[in-house]
C-alpha cells in the first residue's frame, strides 16, 4: 500500500505542474519516528487543501485514493496517540513542491519499519 | 431529482457472466464516485465495489474481487457492473448509489437505484 | 476487516415511543484524519436504502429531527424520539473508514 501512496504523489506532482497553484501547506520536512503517525496526519489533511485549491477531477480521485490506502495500511496504529508532538498549524509552511518531497520522505520511513 | 435506473440483471448459471447498467440523471455524473451494494433474498447488505469519479480507481471487497470489475463511461451517464464467475452466493438485488466524496464533506452513499435482481442457478 | 454488529436485531416499539438502535464495530473506525465514516440507512419494505445519517451525527437533507445519530470511536446509536408508522423497515449502520466498506447486520424495526 505505502508503494501506491509513492505513486500517488508522483501522479499529483505531475499534474499539478501543469497548473499554477500558489498555496504554502503546513510541511513536516524533519519527522521523528516517534511522532510519525502525527506527521501523515498533517501531511493528508494539507493534500485536501490541494485537492480543494486545484478544483483537478484527477487530482481529487488521486487524493482520496491515496487517503484510502494511507487509512487502510494505518489502521491498527492510526489511532495511537503521539505525545509532544508538533500541531499542523505549528508547522513550516513550504510550497507545493517542497511538501511532497517532504510526504514521500515520510511515506518511504513507514515503509523502512512495515 | 437524482435519478439511479439499475439494469440487466436476470438469470444466469453458475460460471457464467452478466453485465449490470446503472443509467443515472439529474445530476453531473462525472462529479461522483458511485458504488453498488447487494442484498441476497431475504438478507442485508453487503457493499460490492467503489469507482473513482473519473474512473481511474476501484475499490472491492475480497468476496468479488477478481471476478467483478466496476466501471463507468461519464460520456453516457452510465455506470457499469461486470460480473464473471457467478456463484450461486451472488444471487441478490443489486442496488447502485452515488457516493459523496471524501473532499466535499465526507464520505457516504447519498441516493440509490431502484435495484436489478440477479440469479444464479442451474 | 472492520466488522459492524448491531443490536436489537429486532425492536418492536409502539407508536410515539423512542426507540434506539445500537452499532459496535470491531476496532475503532476513526480514520487519520480524525473523521469517522459512519453512517445509518433505513430500508422500508419493499424499497431502495436511504440515507439518514452520515459521519456519525450529521443528518441527510430530507430526513425528520426525531432521527438522531451519536457516538464515537467503536460505539454508535441512532435514536428515534417518537416512532411513526412511516419507520418501519430495516436499519442498517455503515462504516466506509477503511476497505473493505461493511455494513451491520441490520435491525428490523416494527410496531408492537
Known amino acids: 500500500n505505502w508503494v501506491n501512496v509513492i505513486s500517488d504523489l508522483k501522479k499529483i506532482e505531475d499534474l499539478i505542474q501543469s497548473m499554477h497553484i500558489d498555496a504554502t501547506l503546513y510541511t513536516e520536512s524533519d519527522v521523528h519516528p516517534s511522532c510519525k503517525v502525527t506527521a501523515m496526519k498533517c501531511f493528508l489533511l494539507e493534500l485536501q487543501v490541494i485537492s480543494l485549491e486545484s478544483g483537478d477531477a484527477s487530482i481529487h480521485d488521486t487524493v482520496e485514493n491515496l487517503i484510502i490506502l494511507a487509512n487502510n495500511s494505518l489502521s491498527s496504529n492510526g489511532n495511537v496517540t503521539e505525545s509532544g508532538c508538533k500541531e499542523c498549524e505549528e508547522l513550516e509552511e513550504k510550497n507545493i513542491k517542497e511538501f511532497l518531497q517532504s510526504f514521500v520522505h515520510i511515506v518511504q520511513m513507514f515503509i523502512n519499519t512495515s | 431529482e437524482v435519478r439511479l435506473m439499475a439494469s440487466g440483471g436476470g438469470l444466469v448459471q453458475p460460471g457464467g457472466s452478466l453485465r449490470l447498467s446503472c443509467a443515472a440523471s439529474?445530476?453531473?455524473?462525472?462529479?461522483?464516485?458511485m458504488s453498488w451494494v447487494r442484498q441476497a433474498p431475504g438478507k442485508g447488505l453487503e457493499w460490492v465495489a467503489t469507482?473513482?469519479?473519473?474512473?481511474?480507481?476501484?475499490y472491492y471487497p475480497d468476496s468479488v474481487k477478481g471476478r467483478f470489475t466496476i466501471s463507468r463511461d461519464n460520456s453516457k451517464n452510465t455506470l457499469y457492473l461486470q460480473m464473471n464467475s457467478l456463484r450461486a452466493e451472488d444471487t441478490a438485488v443489486y442496488y447502485c448509489?452515488?457516493?459523496?466524496?471524501?473532499?466535499?464533506?465526507?464520505?457516504?452513499?447519498?441516493?440509490w437505484g431502484q435495484g436489478t435482481l440477479v440469479t444464479v442457478s442451474s | 476487516d472492520v466488522v459492524m454488529t448491531q443490536s436489537p436485531l429486532s425492536l418492536p416499539v409502539t407508536l410515539g415511543q423512542p426507540a434506539s438502535i445500537s452499532c459496535r464495530s470491531s476496532?475503532?473506525?476513526?480514520?487519520?484524519?480524525?473523521?469517522?465514516?459512519l453512517e445509518w440507512y433505513q430500508q422500508r419494505p419493499g424499497q431502495s436504502p436511504r440515507l439518514l445519517i452520515y459521519?456519525?451525527?450529521n443528518r441527510f437533507s430530507g430526513v425528520p429531527d426525531r432521527f438522531s445519530g451519536s457516538g464515537s470511536g467503536t460505539d454508535f446509536t441512532l435514536k428515534i424520539s417518537r416512532v411513526e408508522a412511516e419507520d418501519v423497515g430495516v436499519y442498517y449502520c455503515?462504516?466506509?473508514?477503511?476497505?473493505?466498506?461493511?455494513f451491520g447486520q441490520g435491525t428490523k424495526l416494527e410496531i408492537k
Open positions: 448509489a452515488r457516493r459523496v466524496s471524501l473532499i466535499t464533506g465526507g464520505w457516504a452513499m447519498d441516493y
Open positions: 439529474e445530476f453531473t455524473f462525472s462529479n461522483y464516485a
Open positions: 469507482i473513482s469519479r473519473g474512473g481511474d480507481y476501484t
Open positions: 476496532q475503532s473506525i476513526v480514520d487519520i484524519t480524525g473523521n469517522t465514516y
Open positions: 459521519k456519525v451525527f
Open positions: 455503515f462504516q466506509d473508514s477503511f476497505v473493505p466498506y461493511t
